[in-house]
Interface confidence: low
């Protein structure tokens, strides 16, 4: 008669079997895994029982279970089955960065040796593609790009071990509104140590601008944050006679537009 696995957890397996016809005084239940060898369940289930629970098992391991009915000096043919324990789910899923089209997430790995992770990102309130990413077993973070703007996503992180998949660590996150880059950006003045730029913007809510001035000679870049009502800005503290790439971004809370890039040079001393 059959052997069934009725409940599987990370460190335990419940089994059930059909009792044979005739008298049974007790059952011998043995279980083995490649890692831990063979064990016998103690105390042995008595003849009235048809279920047992194996405890203290190794997460994510395959166990071979054998049930033999015993009476006096007689024993039945074994019922044999194979079942793997579950693997624990990742925990503490956090979103470390969110942009209009991407998200970054991190989690705490389960204390089990894995073969990888699967990350599934599904739009919640819009129709759109589900994204699935497979990661190496030593990963504990992911960056998912190519997402839809201003969209609520459910993020599920599964731990994988061979053919086993854990329950997911899950979270919900909304990508940010798109931010338009500045328009018509140009250099309006340059001295030996300053460059002045001006620009225009779309009529949309913003919280400011960011300007990065990167010298071609590899010296330290200069970064400034500018108030939202400003449309002209003088970058100071530059080096004379130096070529700069100037990156100008629109900011809106945590979101940042793509940059407008301006080439400019300071005057020679």
């Amino acid at each position: 008669k059959g052997l069934a696995f009725t409940d599987v957890d990370v460190d335990s397996i419940k089994i059930a079997w059909e009792s044979p016809q005739g008298q049974v005084s007790r059952y011998r239940v043995t279980y083995s895994s490649p890692e831990d060898g063979i064990h016998e369940l103690f105390p042995a289930p008595d003849g009235e029982e048809d279920t047992a629970e194996l405890q203290g098992l190794r997460p994510g391991s395959e166990y071979t279970v054998s049930v033999v009915a015993l009476h006096d000096d007689m024993e039945s043919q074994p019922l044999i089955g194979t079942q793997s324990t579950a693997i624990p789910a990742p925990t503490d899923l956090k979103f470390t960065q969110v942009t209009p089209t991407s998200l970054s997430a991190q989690w705490t790995p389960p204390n089990v040796q894995l073969t990888g992770y699967r990350v599934r990102v599904t739009p919640k309130e819009k129709t759109g593609p589900m994204k699935e990413i497979n990661l190496a077993p030593d990963s504990s973070s992911v960056v998912v790009s190519g997402l839809m703007v201003a969209t609520k996503y459910e993020v599920s992180v599964y731990a994988l071990k061979d053919t086993l998949t854990s329950r997911p660590a899950q979270g919900v996150v909304t990508t940010l509104e798109n931010v338009s880059p500045p328009r018509r950006a140009r250099v309006t003045d340059a001295t030996e140590t300053t460059i002045t730029i001006s620009w225009r913007t779309k009529t949309e809510t913003i919280t400011g601008f960011q300007v990065d001035a990167v010298p071609a000679n590899g010296q330290t870049p200069i970064q400034r944050t500018i108030k939202p009502d400003v449309r002209s800005y003088t970058i100071t503290g530059l080096q004379p006679g130096t070529d700069y790439k100037i990156y100008l971004y629109t900011l809106n809370d945590n979101a940042r537009s793509s940059p407008v890039v301006i080439d400019a040079s300071t005057a020679i001393d």
């Epitope: 490649p34 890692e35 204390n111 089990v112 040796q113 894995l114 073969t115 071990k161 061979d162």
Partner: antibody, heavy 118, light 108 residues
Framework: EVQLVESGGGLVQPGGSLRLSCAAS????????MSWVRQAPGKGLEWVSA????????YYADSVKGRFTISRDNSKNTLYLQMNSLRAEDTAVYYC???????????WGQGTLVTVSS | EIVLTQSPGTLSLSPGEKATLSCRAS???????LAWYQQKPGQAPRLLIY???SRATGIPDRFSGSGSGTDFTLTISRLEPEDFAVYYC?????????FGQGTKVEIK
């Protein structure tokens, strides 16, 4: 980058003892099962011993059981193999190996040579 | 213990040729518990394939594994000069884990 660096090998007389060490870096050492695998000169690979991440479970090949002891110090990211009652047939390069499963070795050290000879 | 027998012992081939290495187990090994390693002279072994057919990190796709039960194969589709080495199969289904005796792939 995962790095495993073995040390402690050398020449020892039959019946003598040696303690091998393996310094691990580039990964979170404490939850990972670690093993020692050896290779006699010109021969194939032989698994010697393994230890669970916590150090609570240890496993040995029959050929070394009772003579070798595997241990680890997670605060130092170091794996050890204490080898007693050494025999000529223990002569080999001893590799420290990181496991992804108990016995799947995804990274290996460069090895340390143990020579047992009078 | 499970005994793994590799064949042939030595394989003499030229760069660009296909190499087929065999590993036979004395009893059935779930495909999840079979791995292949490469070892070059004076170096430590390197994991190539696990789970019979999954390539380890950084392993080129000219290496592939297949098989189940007792018969497993490692195939190198086009031999590169750096592929000439000794290859070991390994099972982790039973304790102790065991390795095959190795197949040496040498330049003809």
């Amino acid at each position: 980058e995962v790095q495993l660096v073995e040390s402690g090998g050398g020449l020892v007389q039959p019946g003598g003892s040696l303690r091998l060490s393996c310094a691990a870096s580039g990964f979170t050492f404490s939850p990972i099962t670690m093993s020692w695998v050896r290779q006699a000169p010109g021969k194939g690979l032989e698994w010697v011993s393994a230890i669970s991440g916590s150090g609570g479970s240890t496993y040995y090949a029959d050929s070394v059981k009772g003579r070798f002891t595997i241990s680890r110090d997670n605060s130092k990211n170091t794996l050890y193999l204490q080898m007693n009652s050494l025999r000529a047939e223990d002569t080999a390069v001893y590799y420290c190996a990181k496991s992804t499963h108990l016995y799947l070795f995804d990274y290996w050290g460069q090895g340390t040579l143990v020579t047992v000879s009078s | 213990e499970i005994v793994l027998t590799q064949s042939p012992g030595t394989l003499s081939l030229s760069p660009g040729e296909k190499a087929t290495l065999s590993c036979r187990a004395s009893q059935s090994v779930s495909l999840h518990f079979l791995a292949w390693y490469q070892q070059k002279p004076g170096q430590a072994p390197r994991l190539l394939i696990y789970g019979a057919s999954s390539r380890a990190t950084g392993i080129p796709d000219r290496f592939s594994g297949s098989g189940s039960g007792t018969d497993f194969t490692l195939t190198i589709s086009r031999l590169e000069p750096e592929d000439f080495a000794v290859y070991y199969c390994q099972q982790m289904r039973g304790r102790p884990p065991t390795f095959g005796q190795g197949t040496k792939v040498e330049i003809k």
